[in-house]
């Protein structure tokens, strides 16, 4: 299809290479057609441009990404060529950065309803750079934590090192959809409640003697819990002693609760005691089983592929720590009569 | 949608036996001890005894020791087997998860099984 | 086997009211912790609200809270509603499985 119709937007993504980040692209169909389609406001009022109305569709994922080639090459369609770059709804998620990523990015609703649908489109324009300002040592991250039930703000990392004084008009948006009262480049939260996590995206508009465009950064926020004041606590195995048949295989679980850690090194690993004796078997790999905001449940198995005499003679100990110290706690086995 | 169904339960005449089964769907069970816990009616819950599907290692209540075995029959489902039955076993019987042997998280139940003991 | 005795039935609350239910057990729980309390309304299986004596189950109003440690627990619910009328158990873990019990149950009659 012809794209010289299409609306364009420039869009900056300067990337930090100490971090991994994400970016997004939102579908900007110019309104009203957007109200049709997509169920979100993105736009300013000073951004929307004056366009024929849309007969879109309402399912959100009723559009369809292509990428330019440089060397103008026909329209690639993003879902196949690009594993990297994921389609959600009206909105792209970069996954990686890097200057691969620069290009042309059009969107446009799938289904064509009626003749003037088919200029509904929107042409970005991406260029990716690697951050070079070195003078802002402590810019804001791309993952931020937010303390539940104290207050806490969330910065835009392209704005942090800048006073409010200084800040261009920012705007906002959560999970794709327009925070219209916030314009600084700082929103501040006077409580943390868990509704406050999820993906934020900053834009500011930046000029030079030819044109302008929009510089985008992308922030996963997170609401936390305090880091917990515990050793871990093991679940499982409760009892000291287990009945086992002879020459029967054995699989012994130890599971353990370990609260939140905002810097999180569980260790859980078996080891085996034997008269004086002591060693770390070599077990499968530990596995998160449940995960809440306040706690995860790890489990590692150990695996016996037949009880044996000498096995009736050793204790299995499972060993678990934290930061804040460990747990253990030892089997032995028993022979089952009868 | 984490799921867990009895089934198996209705009328068995005293000194009888019955089979009640507890099928699981929806999430990996292998992390998870199930329990059986029954409700004769208009009474309290009364803990029967669990098994740890990893290696169906089996715990009872003292009272629930001999005349009743859980087990293991497949990689979804658990049974309770109940022998040498009286009226005083009349009640509905449930099963749960729970990822320990002690009583830690029993967040998921069935909706139970009615069983009847009478002549 | 080990005993939890809970604060006799029934205990009424006005809405809006605050009830408070104990529970004491023979012996202490594993961990200190091992304490959950259940809700049952009739013809439904039992709801579990609190784990972990004061751990708060996935979905549960935040009005239910649990306190207590050892062989002393407590289920507090505030600001109590028409639909908080039902029977409330409470559960404990030991070290020898095989003595895990429920309590009694407590019903709330809710004026």
């Known amino acids: 299809f012809n794209i010289s119709g299409c609306s364009t937007k420039k869009l900056l993504w300067t990337y930090s290479t100490r971090s991994e980040e994400e970016f997004v692209l939102f579908c900007d169909l110019p309104e009203p057609q957007k109200s049709h389609f997509c169920h979100r406001n993105r736009l300013s009022p000073k951004q929307v441009p004056e366009h024929l109305p849309f007969m879109g569709s309402n399912d959100l994922s009723d559009v369809q990404w292509y990428q330019q080639p440089s060397n103008g090459d026909p329209l690639e369609d993003i879902r196949k060529s690009y594993p990297h770059i994921i389609q959600d709804k009206c909105t792209l998620h970069f996954l990686t950065p890097g200057v691969n990523n620069s290009g042309s990015y059009i969107c446009r609703p799938k289904m064509i309803k009626s003749p003037y649908d088919v200029a509904c489109c929107v042409k970005m324009i991406l260029e990716v750079k690697p951050q070079t300002n070195a003078s802002c040592e402590y810019s804001a991250s791309h993952k931020q934590d937010l303390l539940l039930g104290s207050t806490g703000s969330i910065s835009c990392p392209s704005l942090s090192c800048q006073s409010d004084a200084q800040s261009p008009a920012v705007t906002w948006y959560k999970n794709g959809k327009l925070l219209s009262v916030e314009r600084s480049n700082r929103i501040v939260v006077d409580e943390v409640y868990d509704y406050h996590q999820g993906t934020y995206v900053c834009d500011y508009t930046q000029s030079d003697t030819v044109s302008s465009w929009t510089v985008r950064a992308v922030v996963q926020v997170r609401t936390i819990v305090g880091d917990t004041k515990l050793k871990p606590d093991i679940l499982d195995p409760v009892e000291d002693t287990l009945e086992v048949e002879l020459g029967k295989p054995l699989t012994i679980s130890c599971k353990a609760r370990f609260g939140f850690e905002r810097v999180f090194n569980p260790v859980i690993k078996w080891y085996i005691k034997d008269s004086d004796l002591e060693w770390e078997v070599s077990v499968p790999e530990a596995k998160s089983i449940k995960s809440t905001l306040k706690d995860e449940i790890i489990e590692r198995n150990i695996i016996l592929e037949k009880v044996t005499q000498r096995d009736l003679r050793r204790k299995f100990v499972c060993f678990v720590q934290n930061s804040i110290g460990n747990t253990t706690q030892s089997v032995q086995l028993k022979e089952k009569r009868g | 949608q984490e799921q867990l169904e009895e089934s198996g339960g209705g009328l068995v005449k005293p000194e009888g036996s019955l089979t009640l089964t507890c099928k699981a769907s929806g999430f990996t069970i292998s992390s998870y001890y199930i329990y059986w816990v029954r409700q004769a009616p208009g009474k309290g819950l009364e803990w029967i005894g669990c098994?740890?599907?990893?290696?169906?290692?089996t715990y009872y209540a003292n009272w629930a020791k001999g005349r009743f075995t859980i087990s293991k029959t497949s990689s979804t489902t658990v049974t309770l087997q109940m022998t040498s039955l009286t009226a005083a076993d009349t009640a509905t019987y449930f099963c749960a998860r729970d990822l320990s042997s002690s009583i830690y998280d029993m967040d998921l139940w069935g909706p139970g099984t009615l069983v009847t003991v009478s002549s | 086997a080990q005993v939890l005795t809970q604060t006799a039935s029934p205990v009424s609350a006005a809405v809006g009211g605050t009830v408070t239910i104990n529970c004491q057990s023979s012996?202490?729980?594993?961990?200190?912790?091992?304490l959950s309390w259940f809700q049952q309304k009739p013809g439904q299986p039992p709801k579990q609200l609190i784990y972990r004596s004061s751990t708060l189950a996935s979905g549960v109003p935040s009005r239910f809270s649990g306190s207590g440690s050892g062989t002393q627990f407590t289920l507090t619910i505030s600001d109590v509603q028409c639909d908080d009328a039902a029977t409330y158990y409470c559960a404990g873990g030991y070290s020898s499985s095989s003595d895990n019990a429920f309590g009694g149950g407590t019903e709330v009659v809710v004026k």
């Open positions: 098994i740890a599907i990893i290696n169906s290692i």
């Open positions: 012996q202490s729980v594993y961990n200190n912790n091992r």
